[in-house]
């Protein structure tokens, strides 16, 4: 009779195992084992005992001892079962990024591993289990579906394999797959508002304003902002499920035209947008020319308003006939126009706007100077001791100097407050000097005496 | 029956060669393991180094690596052990033995005597 | 290296005692473990190999027993041929290594 120890091994791949082949009888004619695996004999004095290393078992095998004694042959054949973890643990790749509410289907790949019998695979969120299953068929392959939540955001999902040789006397074996981070999002299907001048002028700042409300988790959001392929660099405030995007926007000569403002909002694999057209003008203010802005009174002054071939312009309230971007007045310079104001309104059409724009020339008129009896009077009679201030204005541009003086020296302190003496009668040759000439006027002071009672 | 005979022991000085020789019979070197295990003078028993004929792998003790080497030689069905660079603690009876983990058969040894 | 270490290193005993000698290995060596007997003058004997197993042509009054790291090699009845050095091996792991081995001396 022959037997085997140990009739039953577990072993890791590639291992090697002691088989103790022996008969029952004394002095066997054959005693030895058959098998594939590279065999060594550990000798042991005796005729009915022989122990084989087998090395190298890469699968299940099942080595059979024989011995050949008088009373005949017989067998016995040792059980050897390989264990060994599996080669490739992996969850399907999927985007990182899932919509809330959408079912998102785990799909986990199982290469190798045996023996299968004690092969599990596990698909895991966190250290909770979604489903397990025993590994079957090569690669082994399970799938679940999650519905995906808010709070799943950031949750790890992942794949482990239990390879339990427990029952064996062995331990339990793990592999884990790489995890793969769930990052749950909400956009949602309104696409953002956008709040910004419809018309902007070359050469100006415009302050854009772009927001959208219900996003989660809104710190992940992306705002682009570009006016045409100008990108701009908005300052994002964030709410709860909100944010708000600000920036300014700054045009050029070589932006003038229809632009579009675009603002899209990227989470997670989704975007949304809004689109805006801005006008970009130039609309410079208006041209007003004088022929001269200072002439001499009597000249001849013609007014010019001048502005954009498309804007229609009123020069000091009168528009221009016919209604177009350029109008004109003649007029005869009088003391009166001097600090006149002359004063052109352009108006512009953008974009269903209508743009006003003002240009302002003042007239100088140069005449002069004057001497008038109602701002000069030629004749002053004052009781002495009074207090009394001389008054006498001299007109004309530029304003002219005036001087009064009695006997060529003795100056009227034109404008003072003075004490009324006998020496202040006289007649005063009062003289108005500018750059226009001069002229004189006489002005005589009369002094009363009191009258003693 | 299962025999292994040592040879090739002597006096060397510090420093020399020795090479020893097992001759086996009663089995095929090739289909097990051969092993030297020494024994100095008045002391136990210390294991040296290991080979399988079948594939000339090696395995030595700390104490002869890169000095001694293990050899065999499936056609004269016998073991050498190659010993270099001989020191005074190598003095010892060198015994070669049978088996894989354990030593079932030994043979008479060999005394190895390293002195000026 | 794993290091052997046998208690006692020598014992006095009158034939027909029980002996029992004891090997400690410095971290667990399941049942890689053997015994040897060997006279002076002698190659060593096997004994006993795997902790237990007995070998043919060795007479049943010497066994073997433990696991992991504390084994025992029992002399049922001392016999005049059994005085001798005893020695202990494991081999679990390299470098083999021998115990200090322990001498049966005639009380």
């Known amino acids: 009779q022959t037997s085997v120890s140990p009739s039953k091994v577990i072993l890791p791949r590639g291992g090697s195992v002691l088989v103790t082949c022996s008969t029952s009888c004394d002095q066997p004619k054959l005693l030895g084992i058959e098998t594939p695996l590279p065999k060594k004999e550990l000798l042991l004095p005796g005729n009915n005992r022989k122990v084989y290393e087998l090395s190298n078992v890469q699968e299940d095998s099942q080595p059979m001892c024989y011995s050949n004694c008088p009373d005949g042959q017989s067998t016995a054949k040792t059980f050897l079962t390989v264990y060994w973890t599996p080669e490739r643990v992996e969850l399907a790749p999927l985007p990182s990024w899932q919509p809330v509410g959408k079912n998102l289907t785990l799909r986990c790949q199982v290469e190798g591993g045996a023996p299968r019998a004690n092969l599990t695979v596990v698909l895991l969120r966190g250290e909770k289990e979604l489903k397990r299953e025993p590994a079957v068929g090569e690669p082994a392959e399970v799938t679940t579906t999650v519905l995906v939540r808010r709070d799943h955001h950031g949750a790890n999902f992942s794949c482990r394999t239990e390879l339990d040789l427990r029952p064996q006397g062995l331990e339990l074996f793990e592999n884990t797959s790489a995890p793969y981070q769930l990052q749950t999002f909400v956009l949602p299907a309104t696409p953002p508002q956008l709040v910004s001048p419809r018309v902007l002028e070359v050469d100006t700042q415009g302050t854009v304003v772009c927001s959208l409300d219900g996003l989660f988790p809104v710190s992940e959001a992306q705002v682009h902002l570009a006016l045409g392929d100008q990108r701009l660099n908005p300052t994002v405030t964030y709410g709860n499920d909100s944010f708000s995007a600000k920036a300014s926007v700054s045009v050029t000569a070589e932006d003038e035209g229809t632009q579009r403002l675009t603002c899209a909002v990227i989470l997670g694999n989704q975007s949304q947008e809004t689109l805006q057209t801005v006008t970009i003008y130039s609309f410079p203010a208006p041209n007003v020319i004088l022929t001269k802005p200072e002439v001499s009174e009597g000249t001849e002054v013609t007014v010019k308003c001048e502005a954009h071939p498309r804007a229609k312009v009123t020069l000091n309230g009168v528009p221009a006939q016919p209604l177009g971007p350029r109008a004109q007045l003649l007029l005869k310079a009088t003391p009166e126009d001097n600090g006149r104001s002359f004063s052109c309104s352009a108006t512009l059409e953008v974009a269903g706007q209508l743009i006003h724009k003002n240009q302002t020339r003042e007239l100088r008129v140069l005449y002069g100077p004057r001497l008038d009896e109602r701002d000069c009077p030629g004749n002053w009679t004052w009781p002495e001791n009074s207090q009394q201030t001389p008054m006498c204005q001299a007109w004309g541009n530029p304003l002219p100097e005036l001087k009064c003086l009695k006997d060529g020296t003795f100056p009227l302190p034109i404008g003072e407050s003075v004490t009324v003496t006998r020496d202040l009668e006289g007649t005063y040759l009062c003289r108005a000097r500018s750059t226009q000439g001069e002229v004189t006027r006489k002005v005589t002071v009369n002094v009363l005496s009191p009258r003693y009672e | 029956e299962v025999q292994l005979v040592e040879s090739g022991g002597g006096l060397v000085q510090p420093g020399g060669s020795l090479r020893l020789s097992c001759a086996a019979s009663?089995?095929?070197?090739?289909?097990?393991?051969i092993h030297w295990v020494r024994q100095a003078p008045g002391k136990g028993l210390e294991w040296v180094a290991r080979i399988d004929p079948a594939n000339d792998n090696t395995i030595y003790a700390d104490s002869v690596k890169g000095r001694f080497t293990i050899s065999g030689d499936d056609s004269k069905n016998t073991a050498y052990l190659q010993m270099n660079s001989l020191r005074a603690e190598d003095t010892a009876v060198y015994y070669c033995?049978?088996?894989?983990?354990?030593?079932?058969?030994w043979g008479q040894g060999t005394l190895v005597t390293v002195s000026s | 290296d794993i290091q052997m270490t046998q208690s006692p290193s020598s014992l006095s005993a009158s034939v027909g005692d029980r002996v029992t000698i004891t090997c400690r290995a410095s971290?667990?060596?399941?049942?890689?473990l053997h015994w040897y007997q060997q006279k002076p003058g002698k190659a060593p004997k096997l004994l006993i190999y795997?902790?237990?197993q007995s070998i043919s042509g060795v007479p049943s009054r010497f066994s073997g027993s433990g696991s992991g790291t504390d084994f025992t090699l029992t002399i049922s009845s001392l016999q005049p041929e059994d005085f001798a050095t005893y020695y202990c091996?494991?081999?679990?792991?390299?470098?083999?290594?021998f115990g200090q081995g322990t001498k049966v001396e005639i009380k």
């Open positions: 971290q667990s060596i399941s049942n890689n």
């Open positions: 091996q494991q081999s679990n792991s390299w470098p083999y290594t």
């Open positions: 795997h902790a237990s």
């Open positions: 033995t049978t088996s894989g983990y354990w030593f079932a058969y």
């Open positions: 009663g089995f095929n070197i090739k289909d097990t393991y």
